[in-house]
Amino acid sequence: KSSNEATNITPKHNMKAFLDELKAENIKKFLYNFTQIPHLAGTEQNFQLAKQIQSQWKEFGLDSVELAHYDVLLSYPNKTHPNYISIINEDGNEIFNTSLFEPPPPGYENVSDIVPPFSAFSPQGMPEGDLVYVNYARTEDFFKLERDMKINCSGKIVIARYGKVFRGNKVKNAQLAGAKGVILYSDPADYFAPGVKSYPDGWNLPGGGVQRGNILNLNGAGDPLTPGYPANEYAYRRGIAEAVGLPSIPVHPIGYYDAQKLLEKMGGSAPPDSSWRGSLKVPYNVGPGFTGNFSTQKVKMHIHSTNEVTRIYNVIGTLRGAVEPDRYVILGGHRDSWVFGGIDPQSGAAVVHEIVRSFGTLKKEGWRPRRTILFASWDAEEFGLLGSTEWAEENSRLLQERGVAYINADSSIEGNYTLRVDCTPLMYSLVHNLTKELKSPDEGFEGKSLYESWTKKSPSPEFSGMPRISKLGSGNDFEVFFQRLGIASGRARYTKNWETNKFSGYPLYHSVYETYELVEKFYDPMFKYHLTVAQVRGGMVFELANSIVLPFDCRDYAVVLRKYADKIYSISMKHPQEMKTYSVSFDSLFSAVKNFTEIASKFSERLQDFDKSNPIVLRMMNDQLMFLERAFIDPLGLPDRPFYRHVIYAPSSHNKYAGESFPGIYDALFDIESKVDPSKAWGEVKRQIYVAAFTVQAAAETLSEVA
């Protein structure tokens, strides 16, 4: 069949028909439905929601909708033995205890099964000792403490403020510094925007609000007990001592009311500079320990959470492609939430639901996409991207041969200022072209395109007249598809104004106050931003699944490769003497990038000219585009991170959320001046340049004429 026969609607109306079917009112209705009770991974409530979504996707018209279950390691507080932190006096009496749960929001006082704030996968323990305040617990914060201030965290309980980097990196850093416990808290400087009331009167974090979250350092492994393989019925599971990424010291999160009581007594060293001060009325002394009158008091943690192998459920829906059913475009987002999930994830899940409904409507009218579209409602994302990773592990052979693209669909909003997109460079042109066709929802941009408002509010730092598009990092379900399997990936959501709002994420992230009302009252009353995100995500899926030639532009990869090579070279050039001494050269990398640029340019020319009516040649060209992302995968993975296999991008070793370019070289160069064996360290830099240069050259050759 030709693609026109397959689709049954003339091509120019396909996208419009799909987009016109998306309705803000439906997204609102779905969000309400998904947020009335908690849907914590591994619970009966989340299983029931999985079955509901399965049933509704079938009604919407998908060809098949299946549940895919796995038995993975999860973590829960002990219901009868709550977690808390105490200040104890010299007699061991508890003179202050942190809260056991968040004050429930209005209207939710009688909801059961609200999990109290906890750090998922914390080991049990009751350490006591002096407190050290470590700012954000970033790598550079510990450098400041240990190297400049000569403060030793060994045997201390550290208290760190949330923000800037993934909490798992904070815990890893604290462990490496010798701490015996970690307290995480939300400082108003990061989670309370000036001039806005706290929930329920506004979108700011109240003093009793607490951010939940996992503290794993999985590095892409998925289920900690079955790295590399699906946690199925016949899985071999590691012992807990060999599990991947588990923290070794107790960790617990608190709100700023409780943090005030701990921090107000801090003595020892003054904060090194103003960047260590938050907004509480406390001195932000670093410690160790309490001041004068309180110097005999200590802090004690009481952590009793348990790790349990628990069944989780993904929902996988299929809309079979009419022409290339063996090519998969995937739209996936998670379903599990810490509590109500008003933003994370259900603002995303509601959008996916409406996208499925719209595709289903077109299918019922006789249309089919050219390629197969897979829709996924992932489970246990909050516990380490477990549902998506286990499914990808189970289906890795199919995915690496057939995966065209993955579009992520977690939270649709983290603000209501402008669009935010992170994606592979292959998708830059797709995103630009699509947003030029969509209407902006922003005030003051009536009648203007989304591209225009986005570019105005979030301009590219490199290219004038273009919007900022960021690198993919991790911390979400695209990780396994992009970083491990090399499937072109992207994500889009509406975000805040990062210039004026410097707080981290959105204030109520992972708290009990992330409710339907938060979204409906304060973020998006008309659900117009949700609709725009549905149009962007859905539009990307539509184009990827339906365009005759895949909407990937390999020339954009060439541009960023040059930029990344320049950047890593300039980092290395901070050590000119060592580069000379150890004969470190980037020539091979720059040569490979040059070759890639030339070959990509020629490929693009051929792409314009080839006979698109020849299905064999069309398939060949499309396969070269599809497999280009795959060509950046090193089967051996990055050093000590075997599941991060993409040579161009990986999550930063210092912040899982952030993407790092040429991560192998970057990590080899990081803090190289402190390495005990410089010859070995610079040898590793050279090896990583070699790996990067080879990979770029090899990828370029996949775009060469095949014979």
Partner: antibody
């Protein structure tokens, strides 16, 4: 409407025990700190004890420490005061009072009071 | 523990007079101070929190001030229904002690 109703008062001999209850209605009990305050005949107000909204912290006046225990059951919208080793000087009207809604305040006064229940300790 | 003292212990004033009661804490309590009114035979009534914020429904002739250790409650124009004993209370740190009270009546 918002209401606190104390019960459990009465006449008791020195050294014996008594348990006071305070039933709350008309508000989200699980968000509020709760206090007990007493007033001896012809005297001023004396703060007795407080319990945090979630029971995480309990504080007592020195005069009752080790003898009285404050507790709460959020599922029953009720707070309690277990009074052991009672003394003649514990004779008073005992008021249940609502403290701060922890969703809004960490520190707050007592904005709603019950009518009080009388405890008389006498041989 | 923080001790609270009040002065005067009692006062008489005429209707329409401006009346000021002082409360002192033995150590700084920031602005974590509340004022209560108790009429004879009645339950105490919450007037002011955070030293100066009027509880809703309290007449505007009542005002509070101060911070740290020294606080005041002022009735700008004394009314017959203001005859009562007034108590200050520390709620900065436990024990949340009350002052001994100031009895206000009309001459």
């Amino acid at each position: 409407q918002v209401q606190l109703v104390e019960s459990g008062g009465g006449v008791v001999q020195p050294g014996r025990s008594l348990r006071l209850s305070c039933a709350a209605s008309g508000f989200a009990f699980s968000r509020y700190g709760m206090h007990w305050v007493r007033q001896a005949p012809g005297k001023g107000l004396e703060w007795v004890a407080v319990i945090w909204y979630d029971g995480s912290n309990k504080y007592y006046a020195d005069s009752v420490k080790g003898r009285f225990t404050i507790s709460r059951d959020n599922s029953k919208n009720t707070q309690y005061l277990q009074m052991n080793s009672l003394r003649a000087e514990d004779t008073a009207v005992y008021y249940c009072a609502r403290g701060g809604d922890f969703l809004y305040y960490y520190y707050y006064g007592m904005d709603v009071w019950g009518q009080g229940t009388t405890v008389t300790v006498s041989s | 523990d923080i001790q609270m003292t009040q002065s005067p212990s009692s006062l008489s004033a005429s209707v329409g007079d401006r009346v000021t009661i002082t409360c002192r804490a033995s150590q700084g309590i920031s602005n974590y101070l509340a004022w209560y009114q108790q009429k004879t035979g009645k339950v105490p009534k919450f007037l002011i929190y955070e030293a100066s914020t009027l509880q809703s429904g309290v007449p505007s002739r009542f005002s509070g001030g101060g911070s740290g250790t020294d606080f005041t409650l002022t009735i700008s124009s004394l009314q017959p229904e203001d005859v009562a004993t007034y108590y200050c209370q520390n709620y900065n740190s436990a024990p949340f002690t009350f002052g001994p009270g100031t009895k206000v009546d009309i001459k």
